[in-house]
């Protein structure tokens, strides 16, 4: 079997999607329900744990124990205002465990509490299993996507979720970057193009501006709102219908979790309908206290309900343009990503903002991120397909990186949206006379004061010779590599003394020795994989040739053109080879090639004799090759599972 494929997972707030790059193209993989996206839902019942469609389908019956939106919790503290705000909307309980949020549910009759990483890992496990069912072998390597605005701790927590799911997370990449890759593969245009990616999904909103030039992607700017998406539009509909129910039936259903959940499901369905129809109806039997709720909503009313939300999507567009130092006229392509970009009003607002520019909707908006992640996974696994081998991904630092200077000021060395890898150096000095050392505190964030930003790590540079304040020269270098690993070095220029810190996003890192051993093993496996790939390629070439030759001489059109003796000679040899193949699927490359050459030695002279004067190819599209005319092995299969 060829090298196992790596998968790309779009771990969405509301829905997740998995893809794999094989045979030169991306396959978005359907789950066991035939759906190409899977709800990011986990349900706990008295008897079992459900993930995906099965979990979402029973949410109305079991709202307290059906967990969704784990992505809104992951990598956040319990006291985070976002967590506190979101908790109000969730039917499941979130508890505080050392300022870490945990979801508390009843499972098999017991109270259990799970970290967001654990819930996300369950969704990732489901996506892994979906891929394995399709591919037919175990999958371990994956690229997982996150919103552009995820900070270090959110990215690390997502990576941890992958590890818990038994995945080797090759890389965490930004969702818009993944979408850009997907889009780039569909483009064959020449020259540099500025592309604006507008990603409005179920839970996050990201705007990215990228430059795509001959397969090279560079993220110029990102902006967005980590808390805007389809669910917010659902909430507007839910609130609208709660009010309507009050008016019609004089009853408030808002405190009945099951009723609200059932209403929300119907609202989501209506919202989807309104993208293609101007009206949608809701029919919910016995919604509350035995009352059936039959109603409808027009597209115009829906647009009115969400008008401020829809309009707010343009603010990050303007911000991204400013950050990229581009005018809207300089954007060549507008790309829609995320299911919510199907909403006609959203499309119209964007189109109008760009003075009627056509929107690129060629990529299925629900699948574009997973598509790109799958391509990136293939790149990281060393896929040699011509579709991907020239692709270079220049990602960006999602947040500014800097250090604390006097007075708790955040001094950024690497600005947000800087293309990575990057390296920046700046000279700092002492604050006090005869200061013997400096404390280097590394932060990420956009706020002016470090207290409002995220501390990544700290280290001390000591042994500075006594000197008046402002005299010592401390050279600080921030160096971030393609994997987002940050090295911060501080050097006292007078003594050459230096100290450094590596911020890797990896708690519990492997030792140098283990990494070295794994690198060596990886090299060994890479060589083994190549041998295996060549072996399978040789096997397939032999198999193709044998079956093609067999069908060629059995072709009715050859009656009278080929002697029975020659026909028998070819068929006997083909039979020998085909049977040998069946019995020797694990033979070596040399053996397959030897058999193919043997078969060619028998078949080529006979087949070419038939077409010598015909001036056309032989049966099955084979050219009549003269001596030394090539291997004659027919069409080879370039990629094999």
């Amino acid at each position: 079997m060829a090298k196992a494929a790596a998968i790309g997972i779009d771990l969405g707030t509301t829905y997740s999607c998995v893809g794999v790059f094989q045979h030169g193209k991306v396959e978005i993989i359907a789950n066991d329900q035939g759906n190409r996206t899977t709800p990011s839902y986990v349900a706990f019942t008295d008897t079992e744990r459900l993930i995906g469609d099965a979990a979402k389908n029973q949410v109305a019956l079991n709202p307290q124990n059906t967990v969704f939106d784990a992505k809104r919790l992951i990598g956040r503290k319990f006291g985070d205002p976002v967590v506190q705000s979101d908790m109000k909307h969730w039917p499941f309980q979130v508890i505080n465990d050392g300022d870490k949020p945990k979801v508390q549910v009843s499972y098999k009759g017991e109270t259990k509490a799970f970290y967001p990483e654990e819930i996300s890992s369950m969704v990732l496990t489901k996506m892994k299993e979906i891929a394995e069912a399709y591919l037919g072998y175990p999958v371990t390597n994956a690229v997982i996507t996150v919103p552009a605005y995820f900070n270090d701790s959110q990215r690390q927590a997502t990576k941890d979720a992958g590890v818990i799911a038994g995945l080797n997370v090759l890389r965490i990449i930004n969702e818009p970057t993944a979408a850009a890759i997907a889009y780039g593969l569909d483009r064959t245009g020449k020259g540099e193009r500025n592309v604006l990616i507008f990603d409005l999904g179920g839970g996050t909103f990201d705007v990215s501006i990228l430059t795509i030039d001959d397969g090279i992607f560079e993220v110029k700017a990102t902006a967005g709102d980590t808390h805007l998406g389809g669910e917010d539009f659902d909430n507007r509909l839910v609130n609208h219908f709660v009010e309507e129910f009050k008016r019609k039936h004089k009853k408030d259903i808002s405190q009945n979790k099951r009723a609200v959940r059932r209403l929300r499901t119907a609202c989501e369905r209506a919202k989807r309908t309104l993208s293609s129809s101007t009206q949608a109806s809701l029919e919910i039997d016995s919604l509350f206290e035995g009352i059936d709720f039959y109603t409808s909503i027009t597209r115009a009313r829906f647009e009115e309900l969400c008008s401020d939300l829809f309009r707010s999507t343009l603010e990050p567009v303007e911000k991204a343009l400013r950050d990229a130092k581009l005018d809207k006229a300089q954007i060549h392509d507008l790309v829609l990503v995320g299911g919510s970009t199907r909403i006609p009003k959203v499309q119209k607002l964007l189109q109008d903002f760009f003075n009627g520019r056509d929107l690129n909707k060629s990529i299925n908006p629900d699948e574009a991120v997973a598509y790109g992640a799958a391509v990136q996974a293939a790149i990281l696994m060393g896929d040699k397909s011509e579709n991907v081998q020239d692709l270079l991904l220049l990602d960006v630092a999602p947040l500014s990186l800097g250090l604390e200077t006097a007075g708790g000021v955040m001094t950024a060395l690497i600005k947000r949206n800087s293309t990575i890898p990057t390296k920046q150096t700046q000279i700092f000095t002492t604050y006090s006379d005869n200061q013997p050392g400096v404390l280097i505190q590394v932060y990420e964030g956009e706020r002016a004061m470090t207290k409002d930003n995220n501390l990544l790590g700290r280290f001390e540079l000591s042994g500075i010779p006594p000197a008046p304040r402002g005299v010592p020269q401390i050279e600080v270098t921030f160096d971030i590599d393609a994997n987002g690993i940050l090295n911060v070095t501080a050097t006292d220029k007078s003594t050459g003394k230096a100290n450094k810190i590596t911020i890797t996003n990896d708690k519990g890192r492997l030792s140098k020795e283990e990494i070295e051993r794994m690198v060596q093993e990886a090299e060994k496996y890479k060589a083994e994989d190549e041998v295996q790939r060549e072996r399978v390629s040789a096997k397939n070439a032999l198999e193709s040739y044998a079956f093609n030759m067999k069908s060629a001489v059995e072709d009715e059109g050859l009656k009278g053109k080929i002697s029975e003796a020659d026909k028998k000679k070819v068929l006997d040899k083909c039979q020998e080879v085909i049977s040998w193949l069946d019995a020797n699927t694990l033979a070596e490359k040399d053996e397959f090639e030897h058999k193919r050459k043997e078969l060619e030695q028998v078949c080529n002279p006979i087949i070419s004799g038939l077409y010598q004067g015909a001036g056309g190819p032989g049966p099955g599209g084979f050219g009549a090759q003269g001596p030394k005319g090539g291997s004659g092995s027919g069409p080879t299969i370039e990629e094999v599972d």
Epitope: W580, A587, Q601, P605, S631
Partner: antibody, heavy 116, light 112 residues
Amino acid sequence: QIQLVQSGAEVKKPGASVKVSCKASGYTFTNYGMNWVRQAPGQGLEWMGWINTYTGEPTYADDFKGRFTFTTDTSTSTAYMELRSLRSDDTAVYFCARYDHAMDYWGQGTLVTVSS
Amino acid sequence: EIVLTQSPDSLAVSLGERATINCKSSQSLFNSGTRKNYLAWYQQKAGQSPKLLIYWTSTRESGVPDRFSGSGSGTDFTLTIDSLQAEDVAVYYCKQSYTLYTFGGGTKVEIK
């Protein structure tokens, strides 16, 4: 009648090269593969590999990869075996043999002696 | 790689007597599709080129006397010379063509 006629004996110094020819007659050269077999003095037969005379693609046995090259010239119905960087243990008789269901016709053999 | 082991290394048989040479393969040489075993026998007289005697275990090459016969299947094969003649003094080699080609080490047949 079918015949395979090989070139004459060669005496070479270590490090030199030798090219043995095998001229076929009496049949269509490109319809049958040509094998090469080595026999060191007092030893058994060793299969070196073969060449597909129709496509010119060679196959080498594991022990004969690297210094050995099989070629053909279809215009003269001749197969060649070249051996580079000769060593003393390359001293042997080299046979060419046509292959149908087996090696049905053999050349008379060419003795290559490697000596300093 | 398939290894062929011949036994005995040498054998002395009286004129007119039967000579039996064995060849054991490290893996089966049987092809279920063609129902054939891909084993051949060659004779090499002193100072001469080898000569094909038998292929596909038991099919005699044209012109080969019928005192030469081959048998066996799978991994165990036998060449039998029914009534040894003086001109049969030679070294006999088995060769497999099931996958790539390999010769056995040879069996020297002499007159007793």
